[in-house]
């Protein structure tokens, strides 16, 4: 039994780091493998993660972390019974994938303005809380070409757009994702999408 693709890990910079790797053949990850992880720090002890299958030869492990700070460093040991298959290390702050924003809502009752709001996925005491920026994706269910991205570079989790920038009388969907420049993170997953019917009064045309 050998590791074909070494574990790579990403942290949500809150409580979970996810590690994925591939074995050289079909593997029952949960019965045959264990990933031990230990914070390199005074009086820390190793924790055991039981991996799940992620495709035939792929495994994934969700490492629970009681806290995350910028200086954290973990040792990782992948075991198959008594055999050490791989040894490595992981610094969560260097491999951050933020949590996806939630509670995306489209408010259509503001005169001819669409207000999109969502929730910051971090609590106020988390470092990322004040460092997230967002991308909002809006697309038409009827027209695949009607697809747009709005970059929200301010901290407030909201976006205002004129309803008239979208077509009237058809349904749209929106979703949002986040990233943090300070840790050069990857983008989060997209939030669940929300749907609304876009309708607004066309301005009266004078001839």
């Amino acid at each position: 039994m050998k590791v074909l693709q070494e574990p790579t890990c990403v942290s949500d910079y809150m409580s979970i780091s996810t590690c994925e790797w591939k074995m050289n053949g079909p593997t029952n990850c949960s019965t045959e493998l264990r990933l031990l992880y230990q914070l390199v720090f005074l009086l820390s002890e190793a924790h055991t993660c039981i991996p799940e299958n992620n495709g035939g030869a792929g495994c994934v492990c969700h490492l629970l972390m009681d806290d995350v700070v910028s200086a954290d460093n973990y040792t990782l040991d992948l075991w198959a019974g008594q055999q050490l298959l791989w040894k490595g290390s992981f610094k969560p702050s260097e491999h951050v994938k933020p949590r996806a924003p939630g509670n995306l809502t489209v408010h259509t009752n503001v005169s001819d303005t669409l207000l999109l709001t969502w929730s910051n996925p971090y609590p106020p005491d988390n470092y990322l809380y004040n460092h997230l920026t967002y991308a909002v994706n809006i697309w038409s269910e009827n027209d695949p070409a009607d697809f747009r991205i709005y970059n929200v570079t301010y901290l407030e989790p909201s976006l205002r757009i004129a309803a008239s920038t979208l077509k009237s009388g058809i349904s749209y969907r929106a979703r949002v994702r986040a990233w943090a420049q300070c840790y050069n993170t990857t983008w989060s997953e997209w939030s669940p999408s929300t749907k609304w019917h876009n309708s607004y009064r066309e301005p009266f045309e004078q001839h």
Epitope: L39, F41, L42, L43, S44, E45, D66, D67, V69, A71
Partner: antibody, heavy 118, light 107 residues
């Protein structure tokens, strides 16, 4: 509510022994490392000893190494400090403290006073 | 052993003042530094952990900064209950060591 209650202090002659206890409540005791910190009368804080959640890792201050032994009983939510060959300079208020996983003591007991004198 | 040197050892100030206490480590301790407040006859109370994180329940007038060897604790708008003793503590390596303390007195 986290509570740490120390006991076992008292007046003891130099060269004798004493065993301190700390009873913990309000948190999952076996998830955290625990420590003893002392404070001589009118002086500053001095770390004495600490041990990890399952006792696989232990540290001592040089001043107590070889004389003091830290231990814990997770089933009883208790931390102990066995103090042998006590010296007058061991006279202090001994605090039990919970380790906050990133190098800080987030909860402290009220302390138990140990006086070493003939 | 890592020596922690606090300065000043005592400082006089008035209610409403801003005070800064510094702590210097004899070698690099990254961000593994905490600050405590101790009132007479009481156990120490954690104020700041990992150099700059405010402990839950601690008033926002307290703040910490620094990394490596130089750290500061700042108290903005001093309140009457703040006139006590403050300690820094490193946890980069054993033995864990404390600064000698800074006593904050009223002018």
């Amino acid at each position: 509510e986290v509570q740490l209650v120390e006991s076992g202090g008292g007046l003891v002659q130099p060269g004798r022994s004493l065993r301190l206890s700390c009873e913990a409540s309000g948190f999952t005791f076996d998830d955290y490392a625990m420590h003893w910190v002392r404070q001589a009368p009118g002086k500053g804080l001095e770390w004495v000893s600490g041990l990890s959640r399952t006792s696989v890792s232990i540290g001592y201050a040089d001043s107590v190494k070889g004389r003091f032994t830290i231990s814990r009983d997770n089933a009883k939510n208790s931390l102990y400090l066995e103090m042998n060959s006590l010296r007058p300079e061991d006279t202090a208020l001994y605090y039990c403290a919970k380790w906050g996983t990133r190098g800080y003591f987030d909860y402290w007991g009220q302390g138990t006073l140990v006086t070493v004198s003939s | 052993d890592i020596q922690m040197t606090q300065s000043p050892s005592s400082v006089s100030a008035s209610v409403g003042d801003r005070v800064t206490i510094t702590c210097r480590a004899s070698q690099d301790i990254s961000i593994w530094l905490a600050w405590y407040q101790q009132s007479p006859g009481k156990a120490p109370k954690l104020l700041i952990n990992v150099a700059s994180r405010l402990q839950s329940g601690v008033p926002s007038r307290f703040s910490g900064s620094g990394s490596g060897t130089d750290f500061t604790l700042t108290i903005n708008s001093l309140q009457p209950e703040d006139f006590v003793t403050y300690y820094c503590q490193q946890a980069n390596s054993f033995p864990i060591t404390f600064g000698q303390g800074t006593r904050l007195a009223t002018k």
